[in-house]
């Protein structure tokens, strides 16, 4: 069958992308906080 995806399929995909971006941002912030903490402890 040559059936295309519907918008619902593609909207869920968009939501997943947004959540993945948010997760990546959260991890980056966590890493930054950890680095800052290590700098403080290191001093």
């Amino acid at each position: 069958s040559e059936e295309p995806p519907i918008s619902l399929d593609l909207t869920f995909h968009l939501l997943r992308e947004v959540l993945e971006m948010a997760r990546a941002e959260q991890l980056a912030q966590q890493a930054h906080s950890n680095r800052k903490l290590m700098e403080i402890i290191g001093k």
Epitope: P4, P5, I6, S7, D9, L10, T11, H13, L14
Partner: antibody, heavy 114, light 106 residues
């Protein structure tokens, strides 16, 4: 909100060219297979062309009546799909809709007349 | 190409009446899609993948079928249901539409 918005229609002489555009929003455009459908009082609803997504190598398909005259293309970075219409005939007159199976735009009208 | 034949072409129903519109395919398809069009407006997706109602479609509408035989049913006709209904197949290229069923109210 999922939305498709067409533009570019107008009056064109037989043998002339025109390019239609459609901007999408509210979904992951790069994953979509986009199609153009037209409607006229004479022929009713008629599928014109379709372009698959990148995963399917942006494969294109055309109705026999437009093959060799129309070109469908897309720009995923702009969430847009286009229909380049060449060698236009009177029978190409109609309202052109940008579509997904479950979403249609409001259409743009093309009139081919001298 | 797959030819879709809708029946009836025109029909009239009384308020509260059950309405069934049929769409017959010349060869087997995996799903059917339905669109509603009111005069002066663009077609609206109404039922997708045979039986799923598009957003905002009243629950009195339903879709069913398989193979070469599909239908759209209105359990209880209302004045706002007056429109032309089209079926479409996405099973293969070229995509094709039925000729439409114009639904009127008595």
């Amino acid at each position: 909100e999922v939305k498709l918005e067409e533009s570019g229609g107008g009056l064109v002489q037989p043998g002339g060219s025109i390019k239609l555009s459609c901007v999408a929003s509210g979904f992951t455009f790069s994953g979509a297979w986009m199609a153009w459908v037209r409607q006229s009082p004479e022929k009713g609803l008629e599928w014109v062309a379709e372009i698959k997504n990148k995963a399917n190598n942006h494969a294109t398909f055309y109705a026999e009546s437009v093959k060799g005259r129309f070109i469908i293309s897309r720009d995923d970075s702009k969430s847009s799909v286009y229909l380049q219409m060449n060698s236009l005939r009177a029978e190409d007159t109609g309202t052109y809709y940008c579509t997904l199976p479950d979403v249609w735009g409001t259409g743009t009208t093309v009139t081919v007349s001298s | 190409q797959i030819v879709l034949t809708q029946s009836p072409a025109i029909m009239s129903a009384s308020p509260g009446e059950r309405v069934t519109i049929s769409c017959s395919a010349s060869s087997s398809v995996s799903n059917m899609y339905w669109y509603l069009q009111k005069p002066g407006s663009s077609p609206k997706p109404w039922i997708y993948r045979t039986s799923n109602l598009a957003s905002g479609v009243p629950a009195r509408f339903s879709g069913s079928g398989s193979g070469t035989s599909y239908s759209l049913t209105i359990s209880s006709m209302e004045a706002e249901d007056v429109a032309t209904y089209y079926c479409q197949q996405y099973h293969s290229f070229p995509r094709t539409f039925g000729g439409g069923t114009k639904l009127e109210i008595k």
